[in-house]
């Protein structure tokens, strides 16, 4: 079998949902010594980056300026060390937002409910779209989808204090082109008397996995790697 290097990790810096005309940044984390990284878009080569010096950095950032629907879709990356290529990374979905109009989000029976009550979110957008998306702040990867002509409903079932937090919805023109976000709706769920004040709310800061952790190799890292390699050989 043809030898390949381990697959790189692809990430979107700050968010995978990029407002139109703004810049997206994708990071490809591969290996120290990689001489070339390639970013692929929908199966075709999109961009190339050659780190300098290659032995001192374990990945690259690809900047995609002026985001629009032509650049929204599935991205992956690969890297090369010498003549040897890596496996392809997992796919990353890059979405363009702030297209066309703004939906309205409402919640029934209301934004303040008791634990165990059934809650339904309604997302309405008068322009022609068939897919709607509901996201919870701090949980942007957990997208709920629903379908409807101008309005979609998102039944939550009996809620718990874990459902507390801020929600937004989008209308979607295709999987990768979304409307402006709705105004947020904050759901407050009061639990049993003894745990009402203790129930945690979800963080409102950006998702922790949407960060690029590229590192430059220091002399110390190099010495440690060499020491580890020597130790492994001695153990053999």
């Amino acid at each position: 079998p043809k030898q390949t290097l381990p697959k790189p990790i692809i990430r979107a810096e700050s968010t995978y949902m990029v407002p139109k005309e703004k810049q997206a940044t994708l990071c490809c984390q591969g290996s120290y010594g990689a001489v070339e990284y390639q970013l692929h878009f929908e199966g075709s080569l999109f961009a190339v980056e050659r780190p300098k010096p290659p032995e001192r950095i374990n990945g690259v950032k690809f900047h995609i300026p002026d985001m629009n629907s032509r650049k929204a879709g599935r991205y992956s990356c690969i890297y090369r060390v010498g003549e040897l290529w890596s496996e392809r990374s997992d796919l990353l979905d890059l979405v363009v937002t702030e297209m066309y109009d703004t939906p309205t989000l409402s919640v029934h029976p209301g934004p303040e409910v008791t634990s165990g009550e059934k809650v339904t979110f309604y997302c309405r957008l008068d322009t022609a779209t068939s897919m709607f998306l509901l996201l919870k702040e701090g949980r942007s990867r957990d997208v709920q989808r629903s379908y409807g002509k101008v309005q979609a409903e998102f039944p939550m079932g009996p809620v718990t204090t874990a459902h507390r937090g801020s929600y937004r919805c989008f209308g979607s023109y295709n999987n990768y082109a979304w409307s402006f976000p709705s105004e947020p709706v904050k759901l407050l769920v009061t639990g049993d008397i003894e745990n009402t004040s203790l129930a945690p709310t979800d963080p409102t800061f950006p998702d922790s996995w949407d960060t690029c952790l590229l590192t430059r190799e220091t002399g110390l890292q190099k010495d440690l790697a060499l020491w580890d390699h020597t130790a492994q050989n001695l153990l053999r």
Epitope: A47, R50, K71
Partner: nanobody, 126 residues
Framework: EVQLVESGGGEVQPGGSLRLSCAAS????????MGWFRQAPGKEREFVAA???????YYAESVKGRFTISRDNAKNTVYLQMSSLRAEDTAVYYC????????????????????WGQGTLVTVKP
């Protein structure tokens, strides 16, 4: 706003050479990644060559070793030196720019480019 104007196209015999130029207006040229694409009659636009803001280059397999892309930031111009021309190189050649860019990225996909020239025709025939 960036404006790109190509020149240098014309008719040439197989095996001949041509140098295309692309003059860019605006002060953003030094921070732009540049590329050349071409479109033959009845075919889709295809990538030819690209250059990053720090002079890294990338070529389509079909032109590798025959075409050279270069840039002159002082003149706000990118060049495509074409040699050993073949009949299949006949096309309208377009210059394109990605503005702004950061780092050392070379852009290959046409969707990456946000500014385009009007094109210059290159005809290779005996």
């Amino acid at each position: 706003e960036v404006q790109l104007v190509e020149s240098g196209g014309g008719e040439v015999q197989p095996g001949g050479s041509l140098r295309l130029s692309c003059a860019a207006s605006g002060r953003t040229f030094a921070s732009a990644a540049m590329g050349w694409f071409r479109q033959a009659p009845g075919k889709e636009r295809e990538f030819v060559a690209a250059i990053s803001r720090s002079d890294d280059t990338y070529y389509a397999e079909s032109v590798k070793g025959r075409f050279t892309i270069s840039r002159d930031n002082a003149k706000n111009t990118v060049y495509l030196q074409m040699s050993s021309l073949r009949a299949e190189d006949t096309a309208v050649y377009y210059c394109a720019a990605v503005v702004p860019t950061y780092g050392n990225t070379i852009y290959v996909h046409s969707a990456a480019y946000n500014y385009w020239g009007q094109g210059t025709l290159v005809t290779v025939k005996p």
